[in-house]
């Protein structure tokens, strides 16, 4: 499970409201840190295990997923076309 | 290198209590679920306690559970195991282990057995009159 | 509860399998000599530590892992422990462990 943590904002510059947001996840057993729907997410090990990345549902809803070639990570492919890549080191 | 160094083992009195450490280095000790082992002698290995790598989640074995309290000093990458009520079943070596996944910053994770990548030396326990 | 055969025997430069089944999400070997510290051959069902030989090798399929020396060498004669979670997935477990002999 994660939740949406706002930081403290700025105090040292009181015309400024910009605040830094961060996931905190408390994950279960057999699983560990992730991406789904495009956020960090507590996912199924194995899944990262066998990089099965698009079984961790990481693309927005709406988008494909497909596999990168040698499964070094994924593609969210938009209805309009674009892609974005993300590479897994 | 990845150390892990036990202490606070000897000879201890049946209902006694002992507070085991387990300092780590070479790694960085916060991002890693750890574990305590014990083996009693001319016996196998037997799963006693772990903690998440924030410290946040605990779990224990049957054989010590509400007897056993895992902490752990993120600050000073030391893992503890406090044990109360000892008996002559608690005597054996305690080793100290951690579980090879790297939990991210934002994260919580839990060890996993199956992932231990890393042992110290033990520290030998006597629970004896 | 694990199962793990209690002993295995091998002659030097044959191939030694031990067989792990009854846990759930990932499974490790740990090996112990007389007298010595527990060391890690095998972890998360197949990935090997660094400092130890390619012969150590850990495959998963279904619920089962094995762990296969590939020319077994005499220096390899120790208890060998299985580690993974118990069924409930909520604590960790070990088998009884395996004797391997080298002949």
């Known amino acids: 499970t994660c939740e949406i943590v706002t930081l403290d904002r700025d105090s040292s510059q009181p015309r400024r409201t910009i605040a830094r947001q961060t996931a905190r996840c408390a994950c279960r057993k057999g699983q560990i840190a992730g991406t789904t729907r495009a956020r960090p997410a507590c996912v199924d090990a194995r899944i990262i295990k066998t990089k099965q990345w698009c079984d961790m549902l990481p693309c927005l809803e709406g988008e494909g997923c497909d596999l990168l070639i040698n499964r070094s990570g994924w593609t969210c492919t938009q209805p309009g076309g674009r892609i974005k890549t993300t590479t897994v080191s | 290198a990845v150390t892990l160094d036990e202490s606070g083992g000897g000879l201890q009195t049946p209902g006694g209590a002992l507070r085991l450490s387990c300092s780590a280095s070479g790694f960085d000790f916060s991002s890693h679920g750890m574990f305590w082992v014990r083996q009693a002698p001319g016996k196998g290995l037997e799963y006693v306690s772990e903690i998440t790598n924030d410290g946040s989640g605990t779990n224990y074995g049957s054989a010590v559970k509400g007897r056993a309290t895992i902490s752990r000093d993120n600050g000073q990458s030391t893992l503890y195991l406090q044990m109360n009520s000892l008996r002559a079943e608690d005597t054996g070596t305690y080793f100290c282990?951690?579980?090879?996944?790297?939990?991210?910053?934002?994260?919580?994770?839990?060890?996993?057995?199956?992932?231990?990548?890393?042992w110290g030396h033990g520290t030998e326990v006597i629970v004896s009159s | 509860a694990l199962t793990q055969p209690s002993s295995v025997s091998a002659n030097p430069g044959e191939t030694a399998k031990i067989t792990c089944s009854g846990g759930?999400?990932?499974y490790g070997w740990f090996q112990q000599k007389p007298g010595s510290a527990l060391v890690t051959v095998i972890y998360w069902d197949d990935e090997r530590p660094s400092d130890i030989p390619s012969r150590f090798s850990g495959a998963l399929s279904g619920s089962t892992n094995t762990l296969t020396i590939t020319g077994v060498q005499a220096e390899d004669e120790a208890d060998y422990y299985c580690?993974?979670?118990?069924?409930?997935?909520?604590?960790?477990?070990f088998g009884a462990g395996t004797t391997l002999t080298v002949l």
């Open positions: 580690g993974t979670e118990d069924i409930s997935g909520t604590a960790g477990v």
């Open positions: 282990a951690r579980s090879s996944y790297v939990c991210p910053g934002g994260f919580s994770c839990w060890g996993d057995t199956g992932q231990i990548d890393a």
């Open positions: 759930v999400y990932s």
